[in-house]
């Protein structure tokens, strides 16, 4: 079945074009094609191609990037790229990353403030609770799948030969040494940033200093700010601030409208950036392949570990998550996935959940019919705490290292790996240097050697991309599930008490002169002839 198109208050498919530079689907027929419907006649094929142009371009970009990367690295000679030429080669990709990162801060803050302010506290709590439950369950499932696959395929035993080439001295110095408690305290500290401005580009992290105290060397924890956006702190602040604005009633109305307008403007920018995405993705993928030294040897040595991770991600992303989606919604999950191919490819190209967030919001709203207040509330939270891919990879890596170093894993240790991987993947956004540090935490929790983390890092460029794709897919399907939950609860209840979008129905309506109104919104005249209701906004559901 075709994913439901976004509907206006009368239940009709939204017919007006969106500001996505031609991405908008003009009719129900086209929407069917865009959502992966059958394209029969030549006319339909043309329409189908036009509707899916960006998706196709993005997929082509990934393939072209791989081909270009292999071509350049294989050619060598005059084409051989030194560090300075490589940075020039990757520049178009770097530009995409910079554009997406530029958008993240206003998008996350404004969408969450707007989203939290649009929901009544009861609905907000329910929606948040269901989202967190979905994220937790799917992350646990991913962890279990990772452990199961690694125990079955035994990548560590197969890859034991790599030990010999790495040498006995491993590379423990590459493994960050940090107390588990300090990692989680840092997570809590980052949830409550002391400075909102610095949270936009810095996170709190504990390091250690050795001090001589009464003749004994003692390791003293020292807090410091490190480079990297504290997304967790911003997310928490934005949600709480949104709730506070709603509490203000009429006084907070103007500010809510400001954030919603800011958000809309940001989404227009996103729709422009989307068309540049294929170019950027192609060069990011190509650049990474060119950068890798002896990919063949790496695959020969770590092939089974890579296979284990990628197979796990494929099973979870193409079977487990879609099955959960289908069981709860009775809708075709693959139609849903087709609607988010562009952000999934972007996730693969950029290897960043938060950089993919703007495109994901755009696509789930326009292609998969997820209401704005749901997508803009759930997706930023998902990008922060939902990391199925990371949890799966960490579990595979932990079992891989156990097998590699011939250390036993009993039932208690396996449970510990599952729980720690789930917990630390949720907290990874609040822990600077996420992936590797959280893996070190898991290894410490079950007394496994950290020497081999350097091996994991050697293929992180590939596995991390796959992780990111799975992470963002989980976020999107979570948003789709919650949309379905909201639809069901609404159809059951006589009065739609769940959600009220404040920017549409102000408690104390402000006159909006046409010339001063939001240029992104068309206004239509209500029965009384006033132009206060915005047709682009979601109505009461």
């Amino acid at each position: 079945m075709v994913a439901d198109p976004p509907r206006d208050s009368k239940g009709l498919a939204a017919a007006e074009p969106t500001a996505n530079g031609g991405l908008a689907l003009a009719s129900i027929e086209d929407q069917g094609a865009a959502a992966g419907g059958y394209c029969g006649s030549r006319d339909q094929v043309r329409r189908c191609l036009r509707a899916n142009l960006l998706v196709l371009l993005t997929v082509v970009a990934v393939v072209a990037g791989v081909a270009l990367g292999l071509g350049v690295s294989g050619a060598g000679g005059a084409l051989a790229l030194g560090p300075e030429r490589l940075s020039a080669f990757v520049f178009p990709g770097e530009l995409l990353l910079r554009l997406l990162r530029m958008i993240i801060l206003p998008l996350v803050v404004c969408s969450l403030i707007g989203g939290a302010a649009s929901l009544d506290p009861g609905a907000l709590g329910r929606l948040g609770a269901w989202a967190l439950l979905f994220f937790l369950v799917t992350t646990l499932l991913a962890s279990a799948l990772g452990v199961g696959l690694a125990l079955a395929l035994q990548p560590g035993a197969a890859s034991a030969a790599i030990n010999a080439s790495v040498g006995a001295a491993g590379s423990a110095e590459n493994a960050p040494s940090k107390e588990v408690l300090d990692s989680f305290l840092d997570l809590a500290r980052n949830i409550f940033p002391s400075n909102l401005v610095s949270a936009a580009f810095r996170s709190y992290s504990t390091t250690y200093e050795e001090r001589n105290i009464t003749g004994t060397r003692v390791k003293v924890p020292v807090g410091q700010e490190v480079e990297g956006m504290n997304i967790l702190g911003l997310v928490v602040f934005a949600i709480v601030f949104g709730v506070a604005l709603r509490k203000l009633g009429p006084e907070g109305e103007l500010l809510i409208r400001f954030f919603n307008s800011f958000n809309e403007a940001t989404m227009v920018l996103v729709s422009w950036i989307m068309w540049y995405a294929p170019v950027g993705i192609m060069f990011l993928v190509a650049g990474k392949i060119v950068e890798m030294e002896d990919v063949g040897l790496l695959f020969a040595r770590l092939g089974k570990y890579i296979l284990c991770c990628l197979l796990g991600h494929a099973i979870h992303g193409l079977l487990v998550l879609p099955l959960i989606y289908f069981l709860f919604t009775r809708k075709n999950p693959y139609r849903f996935l087709w609607g988010i191919v562009t952000p999934l490819a972007t996730a693969f190209g950029t290897s960043s959940s938060s950089a993919t967030l703007p495109l994901m919001m755009k696509c789930v709203e326009e292609n998969n019919g997820v209401a704005k207040h749901i997508s803009r509330f759930i997706l930023p939270i998902g990008a922060t705490v939902n990391m199925d891919g990371a949890a799966l990879f960490q579990c595979v890596a932990a079992v891989f290292i156990a097998q590699l170093s011939q250390q036993s894993l009993d039932f208690v240790k396996i449970i510990t790996i599952l729980v720690t991987a789930t917990a630390s993947s949720v907290g990874a956004a609040g822990i600077p240097a996420g992936g590797v540090l959280t893996l070190a935490i898991i290894l410490e929790a079950v007394n496994l050697p950290v020497d081999h983390i350097s091996l994991i890092l050697a293929v992180d460029w590939l596995v991390d991309r796959s992780c990111t794709v799975l992470n963002v897919e989980g976020d999107a399907l979570g948003a789709g599930l919650l949309q379905n939950y909201v639809d069901r609860t609404e159809s059951r209840s006589t009065e739609p008490e769940l959600i009220q979008v404040k920017s549409e129905l102000p408690l104390d309506p402000l006159p909006v002169p046409t010339e001063e109104g939001n240029p992104l919104l068309k206004h239509y005249r209500g029965p009384a002839g006033d132009a206060t209701v915005a047709s682009e906004k979601e109505s009461v559901m």
Epitope: A157, A158, A160, A161, N163, A164, A168, A169, G170, A172, S177, Y208, K219, Q403, L404, S405, Q406, Q407, S408, E444, N447, L448, P449, V450, D451
Partner: antibody
Framework: QVQLVQSGSELKKPGAPVKISCKAS????????MSWVRQAPGQGLKWMGW????????IYGDDFKGRFVFSLDTSVSTAYLQISSLKAEDTAVYFC?????????????WGQGTTLTVSS | DIQMTQSPSSLSASLGDRVTITCRAS??????LNWYQQKPGKAPKLLIY???RLHSGVPSRFSGSGSGTDYTLTISSLQPEDFATYFC?????????FGQGTKLEIK
């Protein structure tokens, strides 16, 4: 009970090879890694490396790459240490030690040691 | 590689004495510290692993403690069979390294 029984003492000339065996009993051989440790006369203990008994893959310490070879015969639960082109400084007691399967790197059971003397 | 420094290098004690041997690592080894006993002409025997856990069959008069870089082995009441050389060993990272040994002699 767990037992590691090593081959007897060896007296070799410089340049000759030697092969020391370590037969394990009392546990599943392929479950635990086997390490080799050297103790030169009047000196401390020095870890030489270990062999992954399930995969049969050797891992050598930095000072023991080249002339030293670890091998296995899993059918008789035996690990071997082979040293080629012996030098006078190879004179030492060589121990095989079972690597514990927990708490990273420690050795819970040791062979009785094989004394190797290299002299012309 | 992580350096392990034992002190003292030798010590004399009488039967029934309480003896403490210390071991210092060149960096934090996160409790992955093990103690071995070796008698002349014999193989080392594991006494304590992971700082304080007694290996099976080891008398309870042996105990271990410490954290970070500093660790100790304590024998609460010396017995005749305890006179030997004691080695500490870090198992935190490859390569595992041993202390130079502490020779415990009868006074």
């Amino acid at each position: 009970q767990v037992q590691l029984v090593q081959s007897g003492s060896e007296l070799k000339k410089p340049g000759a090879p030697v092969k020391i065996s370590c037969k394990a009993s009392g546990y599943t051989f392929s479950t635990f890694g086997m390490s080799w440790v050297r103790q030169a006369p009047g000196q401390g203990l020095k870890w030489m490396g270990w062999i992954h008994t399930y995969a049969g893959v050797p891992i050598y310490g930095d000072d023991f790459k080249g002339r030293f070879v670890f091998s296995l015969d899993t059918s008789v639960s035996t690990a071997y240490l082979q040293i080629s082109s012996l030098k006078a400084e190879d004179t030492a007691v060589y121990f095989c030690a079972r690597r514990s399967d927990n708490y990273r790197y420690f050795f819970d059971y040791w062979g009785q040691g094989t004394t190797l003397t290299v002299s012309s | 590689d992580i350096q392990m420094t034992q002190s003292p290098s030798s010590l004399s004690a009488s039967l029934g004495d309480r003896v403490t041997i210390t071991c210092r690592a060149s960096q934090d080894i996160r409790n992955y510290l093990n103690w071995y006993q070796q008698k002349p002409g014999k193989a080392p025997k594991l006494l304590i692993y992971y700082t304080s856990r007694l290996h099976s069959g080891v008398p309870s008069r042996f105990s271990g403690s410490g954290s970070g870089t500093d660790y100790t082995l304590t024998i609460s009441s010396l017995q005749p069979e305890d006179f030997a050389t004691y080695f500490c060993q870090q198992g935190h990272t490859l390569p595992p390294t041993f202390g130079q040994g502490t020779k415990l002699e009868i006074k």
